[in-house]
């Protein structure tokens, strides 16, 4: 999947664009908003009716090297009595993000953009029920 | 930057950390994943904390279209199909990396940008405090 070129409907390519070899693009990995602190709701993963745990995956050939994945704790959802109700389903909610992958071929190094699917949390859903003949 | 194990036979000049600027292949590796969450599942409608999906489009960004979730209700849907306001629909937020055209409008020059997106909603049981 290629990154779309800038459409002329939006704007003309400025003269100031850096020269880039064919088939590749220049990527600055100094992240914009790197230090912005987000005030996430505290411990929603524990208070949710479809609670989840977090696992940190680590890969030194990936940037960022740390990616956090959520896993639903239960198959069902937690009811008002604090018990698991298996007539409902805890399901993962997923979001794509981009990472930079470093590849070693002998002593040369190349870089590749990669889409990674991250599970960010869980939600409680009413299952669609089919009765099989 | 992050440290990388190096092949012992390679020249010592290679940097252990990711360089600040890299040249990357224009093809993005991985799964022609469906970026429209409306097509990938109907959880947004079947959840006890349902949400609407809003299209956020920016031609200076890749991906140019990002879907933002907004919880439909303050409370959660109970077994009778009514909103229970003793529970909360809460957005699940996630920081993701996108590409920002830099300098602006350039077709093949980008910078990574971290943005916060609401991906969906979850139903939460709040701890209740009575204020004196």
């Amino acid at each position: 999947r290629k990154i779309p070129k800038v459409g002329h409907t939006f704007f003309q390519k400025p003269e100031s664009c850096p020269p880039v070899p064919g088939g590749s693009m220049k990527l600055d990995i100094g992240i914009i908003n790197e230090n912005q602190r987000v005030s996430m709701s505290r411990n929603i993963e524990s208070r949710s009716t479809s609670p989840w745990n977090y696992t940190v995956t680590w890969d030194p050939n990936r940037y960022p090297s740390e990616v956090v994945q959520a896993q639903c704790r239960n198959l069902g959802c937690i009811n008002a009595q604090g018990k698991e109700d298996i007539s409902m389903n805890s399901v993962p909610i997923q979001q794509e993000t981009l990472v930079v992958r470093r590849k070693h071929q002998g002593c040369s190094v190349s870089f590749q953009l990669e889409k990674v699917l991250v599970t960010v949390g869980c939600t409680c859903v009413t299952p669609v029920i089919h009765h099989v003949q | 930057g992050i440290t990388i194990p190096r092949n012992p036979g390679c020249p010592n000049s290679e940097d252990k950390n990711f360089p600040r600027t890299v040249m990357v292949n224009l093809n993005i590796h991985n799964r022609n994943t469906n970026t429209n969450p409306k097509r990938s599942s109907d959880y947004y409608n079947r959840s006890t904390s349902p949400w609407n999906l809003h299209r956020n489009e920016d031609p200076e960004r890749y991906p140019s279209v990002i879907w933002e979730a907004k919880c439909r209700h303050l409370g959660c849907i109970n077994a009778d199909g009514n909103v229970d306001y003793h529970m909360n629909s809460v957005p699940i937020q996630q920081e993701i990396l996108v590409l920002r055209r830099e300098p602006p409008h350039c077709p093949n020059s980008f910078r990574l940008e971290k943005i916060l997106v609401s991906v969906g909603c979850t139903c939460v049981t709040p701890i209740v405090h009575h204020v004196a």
Epitope: S39, S41, R42, N43, I44, R47 | K70, C71, L74, N88, V90, V124, P126, I127, V128, H129, H130, V131
Partner: nanobody
Framework: EVQLVESGGGSVQPGDSLRLSCAAS????????FGWFRQAPGKEREFVAG????????EYANSVKGRFTISRDNSKNTVDLQMDSLRPEDTAVYYC?????????WGQGTLVTVSS
């Protein structure tokens, strides 16, 4: 610690208006929504109206839709409930509620009496 100060309750006649206010102070950051519940004598506490902090989305109980209006002032952490065309069945103790997603704070309540 969070403090909630409610004001504006009182006695009115049917058809009259009243405006309730609630001010939050202390560690009232990361607000999810702000709103009002009420409890009539011998009845369960019920939701009246709420306003989401992030985008000012509002929600109302069917019984008050079209008569009550909730509004907020972000800079002051206050929420107001404008109650018009009041009815005897609106008589109740009105509780201000500040919701921080995983924690919810209830005020002490202010009495609204509607009778002729």
């Amino acid at each position: 610690e969070v403090q909630l100060v409610e004001s504006g309750g009182g006695s009115v006649q049917p058809g009259d208006s009243l405006r309730l206010s609630c001010a939050a102070s202390g560690r009232a950051n990361s607000i999810n929504w702000f709103g009002w519940f009420r409890q009539a004598p011998g009845k369960e506490r019920e939701f009246v109206a709420g306003i989401r902090w992030s985008d000012a989305y509002t929600e109302y109980a069917n019984s008050v839709k079209g008569r009550f209006t909730i509004s907020r002032d972000n800079s002051k952490n206050t929420v107001d409930l404008q109650m018009d065309s009041l009815r005897p069945e609106d008589t109740a103790v009105y509780y201000c509620v500040l919701d921080l997603s995983t924690v919810r704070y209830w005020g002490q309540g202010t009495l609204v009496t509607v009778s002729s």
